[in-house]
């Protein structure tokens, strides 16, 4: 029986060019965490395996840093990073727990200001 719950940072926003921490926390279970996956759409961004540690997708290694803890830090954000992110906890004996975070990457206020007052 799965008794655990996942708490996440929920819906978050950040400025283009900045960084953000995606954080999930599994509580209310004594199950052993064997691996945590961080996913965007249906692709793996990173994994943290209990035995093997962190692995980051080569496509994201320049912009993704492991941690803090089992979280994930996204750097040099672009508007294309906007979307759903999932933390997936593989546990024994409970099974799989999934948390969802929606990230919105906003144009920086400086960029918005500049675009609004462009000189023809």
């Amino acid at each position: 029986m799965m008794t655990g719950t996942i708490e996440t940072t929920g819906n978050i926003s950040a400025e283009k060019g900045g960084s953000i921490i995606l954080q999930c926390h599994l509580s209310s279970t004594t199950a052993q965490v064997t691996q945590v996956n961080w996913e965007q759409q249906d692709q793996l961004l990173a994994i943290c395996n209990a035995d093997l540690g962190w692995h980051i997708s080569p496509s994201f290694k320049d912009r993704v840093a492991p941690g803090p803890g089992l979280g994930l830090t996204l750097q040099s954000l672009t508007v294309n990073d906007t979307g759903e992110y999932f933390c997936i906890y593989h546990t024994y004996p409970d099974g799989t727990y999934t948390g969802r975070i929606f990230l919105e990457v906003l144009e920086s206020s400086v960029a918005e200001h500049g675009a609004r007052f462009q000189i023809p």
């Epitope: 996913e39 249906d42 692709q43 395996n49």
Partner: nanobody, 125 residues
Framework: QVQLAESGGGSVQAGGSLRLSCAAS????????MGWFRQAPGKEREGVAV????????YYTDSVKGRFTISQDNAKNTLYLQMNSLKPEDTAMYYC??????????????????WGQGTQVTVSS
Amino acid sequence: QVQLAESGGGSVQAGGSLRLSCAASGVTSDSYHMGWFRQAPGKEREGVAVIKTGDASTYYTDSVKGRFTISQDNAKNTLYLQMNSLKPEDTAMYYCAARRGWVPAPLSQYNYNYWGQGTQVTVSS
């Protein structure tokens, strides 16, 4: 959404052969890791064989090397597992699995997000 449907399981004597098939729908032209996993009663699901569709790289667990062969038919979007010299310890439910893009440890069940319903393979001595 990717959907996977296995077939070809059955009962066979030790030393015999079976060919499993996995029909995949919803698979795009992107690179995928597609593989076969198995789970015997009371045991954890384990990776058997995986193929990367982009470059046809293959990965096998040690216990099946030289006996099992994974292959794909891109035109039919079908994955195969040819199993020869079967042993009683190969008895298990066999599952087809897939993941688009990067997979750090191809034979780890934790790295796949699309799964079929499974097909039973029973090898008697």
